[in-house]
């Protein structure tokens, strides 16, 4: 299950009103609408793990789920890079990889995912409330960033099976991205809706999953999603505490996870050990799309506990320049 922009349910036309032609004009907008809302919107997922053996050692994994080509990945901690965060590593798919202490090893795991091992000793060592952010610059989507931190040890979701976390979508640049065909489809859809407005037509009824959806709109984001639109950056900070978990773990000892997976079809595909590791159903999940952060959960992001805002003064194209993205 994932919280998305809700597509209103279209009631079938009253008999004899539009006939076969009317039926087709209803199906087509529905299909186009689904495409408009879901296509062209990449996502970034983040997983943070504290090693059971070394409590000050972290492994961060990030992945990009989009059709564009990745031109740069920046991993930072303490918030987004350029907004109070500190760069830990910069990875270019062809030019190379750079990392700075306490990063120990940054690497590409696949063409669209990276991992970073941090070892902590001394002042620069990370702790459980550290927020890690991954920013993917890609073409043609632009920059997409996600942040995650370890959930508190009391998190009940730790022993939950790996179920997808709900993710709030902030569809801005992505909706019109990628394909001209899609753009044309969306324009055509608006044209159809306008035509419907000027003649007797089936009335739009908000879907059951979003009772607050405005009746006059072709689609409306969920309440939380709307709230997300005006939260420039939100990151969940959890408290720093020792790992004292006794939770049974299939991969050798206790391990804390913060994860930002997507719906089941887009579950991050990493090595088997990673993929099968229990991921909390509810924890410090953060979805970030095109620089918009939202806490995944039922509350609107700005009411979440321990929420820290990081406005990015550089905007979605901030990764362009001498880092190999031009």
């Amino acid at each position: 299950m994932r919280t998305e922009a809700q597509v209103p349910a279209l009631q079938p036309p009253e008999p004899g009103l539009e006939g076969a032609m009317g039926h087709r004009t209803l199906v087509l907008p529905w299909v186009l609408l689904t495409l408009c809302v879901t296509a062209g919107t990449p996502e970034v997922w983040v997983q943070v793990r504290m090693e059971a053996t070394e409590l000050s050692s972290f492994t961060i994994r990030c992945g990009f789920l989009g059709s564009g080509s990745i031109s740069l990945v920046t991993v930072s901690w303490g918030g987004p890079n350029g907004a109070g965060g500190t760069t830990l590593a910069v990875l270019h798919p062809e030019r190379g990889i750079r990392q700075w202490a306490p990063a120990r090893q940054a690497r590409w795991e696949t063409q669209s995912s990276i991992s970073l091992i941090l070892e902590g000793s001394g002042a620069s060592s990370p702790c459980a409330n550290t927020t890690f952010c991954c920013k993917f610059a890609s073409f043609p989507e632009g920059s997409w960033e996600a942040c995650g931190s370890l959930p508190p040890s009391s998190d009940p979701g730790l022993s939950a099976p790996p179920t997808p976390a709900p993710i709030l979508r902030a569809d801005l640049a992505g909706i019109l991205g990628v394909s001209g065909v899609l753009l044309f489809g969306c324009v055509y859809l608006l044209h159809l809706l306008r035509r419907h407005k000027h003649r007797p037509a089936p009335r739009l009824q908000p879907s059951r999953t979003s009772p607050q959806a405005p009746r006059a709109r072709a689609w409306a984001p969920s309440q939380a999603s709307q709230a997300a639109l005006h939260v420039p950056y939100a990151t969940i900070n959890t408290s720093c505490r020792p790992a004292t978990l006794d939770t049974a773990h299939p991969h050798g000892g206790p391990s804390w996870w913060a994860s930002l997976p997507t719906h089941a079809a887009h579950r991050p595909q990493g090595p088997a050990a990673w993929a099968s590791t229990p991921i909390p159903a509810r924890g410090s999940f953060v979805s970030v799309e095109n620089g918009l952060y939202a806490q995944a959960g039922e509350r609107p992001p700005h009411t979440g506990p321990g929420l820290t805002l990081f406005p990015d003064p550089r905007g979605p194209r901030a990764m362009e320049g001498p880092l190999g993205v031009r």
């Epitope: 350029g82 500190t86 760069t87 798919p93 995912s113 901030a318 320049g321 001498p322």
Partner: antibody, heavy 114, light 113 residues
Framework: EVQLQQSGPELVKPGASVKISCKAS????????MNWVKQSHGKSLEWIGD????????NFNQKFKGKATLTIDKSSSTTYMELRSLTSEDSAVYYC???????WGQGTTLTVSS | DIVMTQSPSSLSVSAGEKVTMSCKSS????????????LAWYQQKPGQPPKLLIY???TRESGVPDRFTGSGSGTDFTLTISSVQAEDLALYYC?????????FGGGTKLEIK
């Protein structure tokens, strides 16, 4: 247009220290990750180290640890490399270069001579 | 440290000829995760700083003429100039962009007859 402007040539005595600069312009301040490279006369290039502008974090070629110190002044978008306990072996042209070596400064010639 | 070995150390060709130079690394520069080779080629003309020509073993930097081609994988790499021009007179360096320290080869000096 990205430009890396380095300080002028230096003539110093053995045992002394020198600080050469590299002023970056034409791109986002936080993107001033900088490499330093040494080229001895008639020889190849040697990577000295790099600096992260966010926190001044550095990486060094083991060979230059203790010899070079890298710092950054964000307000002037300038990176500095200080070389200490200079010997004739340190006489070379020193270049600053952007993170993935796609932009280079014009070079600073250092001559260590008594 | 990864050792980069270039050959030949110098070569002399006439304008219009095709030229190839080799670079070998002591360890593989292939990143297994994304199957990319982290090797770069630079051109350095007299009195100038090096100029990035090729990165990722085969991707031309923007503005670099298409007569320059990089190839190879793992530990063996080649820079080819399909039709040498007078302005190509320079030193050519390969560089390990895979892991620190980012070592350079000894260079190949290209002279025009």
């Amino acid at each position: 247009e990205v430009q890396l402007q380095q300080s002028g040539p230096e003539l110093v005595k053995p045992g002394a220290s020198v600080k050469i600069s590299c002023k970056a312009s034409g791109y986002t301040l936080t993107d001033y990750y900088m490499n330093w490279v040494k080229q001895s006369h008639g020889k190849s290039l040697e990577w000295i180290g790099d600096i992260n502008p966010n926190n001044g974090g550095t990486n060094f070629n083991q060979k230059f640890k203790g010899k070079a110190t890298l710092t950054i002044d964000k307000s002037s978008s300038t990176t500095y490399m200080e070389l200490r306990s200079l010997t004739s072996e340190d006489s070379a042209v020193y270049y600053c270069a952007s993170l993935f070596f796609d932009y280079w400064g014009q070079g600073t010639t250092l001559t260590v001579s008594s | 440290d990864i050792v980069m070995t270039q050959s030949p150390s110098s070569l002399s060709v006439s304008a219009g000829e095709k030229v190839t130079m080799s670079c070998k690394s002591s360890q593989s520069l292939l990143n297994s995760g994304n199957q990319k080779n982290y090797l770069a080629w630079y051109q350095q003309k007299p009195g100038q700083p090096p100029k990035l020509l090729i990165y990722g073993a085969s991707t031309r930097e923007s503005g670099v003429p298409d007569r320059f081609t990089g190839s190879g994988s793992g530990t063996d790499f080649t820079l080819t100039i399909s039709s040498v021009q007078a302005e190509d007179l320079a030193l050519y360096y390969c560089q390990n962009a895979h892991s620190s320290p980012y070592t350079f080869g000894g260079g190949t000096k290209l002279e025009i007859k």
